[in-house]
């Protein structure tokens, strides 16, 4: 049974709460290290691979040392969702061409999703101002050619990993200041 | 073959500072964090810090915040770790070693660099 | 900081037997499916090397007779048959929070 009726919630641990975001943050890391090695291997593609319609890393947004949780929570959130719909529209323009890296992408998309969902429940137990909705985004143009399609999957899986990473680094180094 | 090379062993007076470089090649450089580990005589192996070469400067074991600083020249795919305020007790061997993104285990490691600190 | 202590930490041996090298955290380091620690070898004058991470994957380049084992707060390095090139100091670390810690070593010497 739970607390009796009128009676507030224990309020969350946040370190705990912090803890079980970074864990999650940290698999969905390793996953996409994985496929990462998986496309490497099957269309390997020398060289910095851009997209526009990425978001600028976050590791620009300053350094770690002197970032506050709403703010690294805000930005991983803002990225993140950025990411999960270019790992849709992947999925979507290069379905053929990438079918040897499922079900690793839909696994991927999975997990970001479950990320985001995990983000936005930090977010409100911590008591943090809810973002309005994003503005829809305007459609993303298809690959001009498999081959674009390719560098755009570089592109987007490289810029994910360095934004797990720095998500890991700074919501760990918040951890410790918790 | 990946490999990192630092550069040679220093004498320093206690109160000065010493920089260290890292020079990796053989991997895309903005891959991997880089890390920095002390060992100093008879004490166990400690983390110092790491760094991530694409940006948003580096994190630090709290021992070391406030005497340890690390950069990276991307383009000379060079890391550096400077280390002021000298004592007798950073007497050790510095090594830089390339860590795994989010994961901090670390499969290459440079030569170290012995740091003597002495009056 | 989480403090990883080993053990024995000195352990003497003859080539061709089975070496068990244990590594205790003072407080668990398996989350999700994952264990943060990591084994390494060290030689006199030389870097460490990384054998096993993430608890039981064996680094490329090292001989599968190097195996890792554990969850939680016990963890365990095994050499299933000690060459002479083995005899070295051994060191778990993890890296399930910051700052990420080394245990003490345990020195592995020839019989």
């Known amino acids: 049974p739970g607390p009796p009726p009128g009676s507030p919630r224990a309020s969350p641990d946040p370190r705990a709460e912090l803890d079980s975001t970074v864990l999650l943050t940290r698999s969905l890391l390793e996953d996409t290290r994985q496929l990462t090695i998986q496309l490497k291997d099957k269309f390997p593609a020398d060289g910095d691979h851009n997209l526009d319609s990425l978001p600028t890393l976050a590791m620009s947004a300053g350094a770690l040392g002197a970032l506050q949780l709403p703010s690294v929570l805000t930005r991983l959130r803002a990225d993140l969702l950025s990411y999960l719909r270019h790992v849709q529209w992947l999925r979507r323009a290069m379905g053929s061409s990438l079918k040897t890296l499922e079900p690793e992408l839909g696994t991927l998309q999975t997990r970001l999703d479950r990320l985001l969902r995990r983000l936005q429940l930090l977010m409100s137990r911590l008591a943090l101002p809810q973002l309005p909705p994003d503005p829809p985004a305007p459609p993303l143009a298809p690959p001009s050619s498999t081959w674009g399609g390719i560098r755009a999957a570089h592109a987007i899986l490289g810029g994910l990993h360095l934004t797990l990473d720095w998500a890991v680094r700074g919501l760990l180094l918040l951890k410790t200041r918790l | 073959e990946v490999q990192l090379v630092q550069s040679g062993a220093e004498v320093k007076k206690p109160g000065a500072s010493v920089k260290i470089s890292c020079k990796a090649s053989?991997?895309?450089?903005?891959?991997?964090?880089m890390d920095w580990v002390k060992q100093a005589p008879g004490q166990r192996l400690e983390w110092i810090g790491d760094?991530?070469?694409?940006?948003?400067?580096?994190i630090y074991n709290q021992k070391f915040t406030g005497r340890a600083t690390l950069t990276v020249d991307k383009s000379a795919s060079t890391a550096y770790m400077e280390l002021s305020s000298l004592r007798s007790e950073d007497t050790a061997v510095y090594y830089c070693?390339?860590?795994?993104?989010?994961?901090?285990?670390?499969?290459?490691w440079g030569q170290g660099t012995t740091v003597t600190v002495s009056s | 900081d989480i403090v990883l202590t080993q053990s024995p930490a000195s352990l003497a041996l003859s080539p061709g037997e089975r070496a068990t090298l244990s590594c205790r955290a003072s407080?668990?380091?398996?989350?999700?499916?994952?264990?943060?620690i990591h084994w390494y070898q060290q030689k006199p004058g030389q870097a460490p090397r990384l054998l096993i991470y993430l608890a039981s994957n064996l680094e490329s380049g090292v001989p599968a007779r190097f195996s890792g084992s554990g969850s939680g707060t016990d963890f365990t390095l095994t050499i299933s048959s000690l060459e002479e090139e083995d005899f070295a100091t051994y060191y778990c670390?993890?890296?399930?929070?910051?700052?990420?810690?080394f245990g003490q070593g345990t020195k592995l010497e020839i019989k």
């Open positions: 670390q993890h890296s399930r929070d910051l700052p990420p810690t």
């Open positions: 760094i991530n070469p694409h940006g948003g400067g580096p």
């Open positions: 407080k668990s380091v398996s989350t999700s499916g994952y264990s943060y």
């Open positions: 053989g991997y895309t450089f903005t891959d991997y964090n």
């Open positions: 070693a390339r860590g795994e993104l989010g994961h901090w285990y670390f499969d290459v």
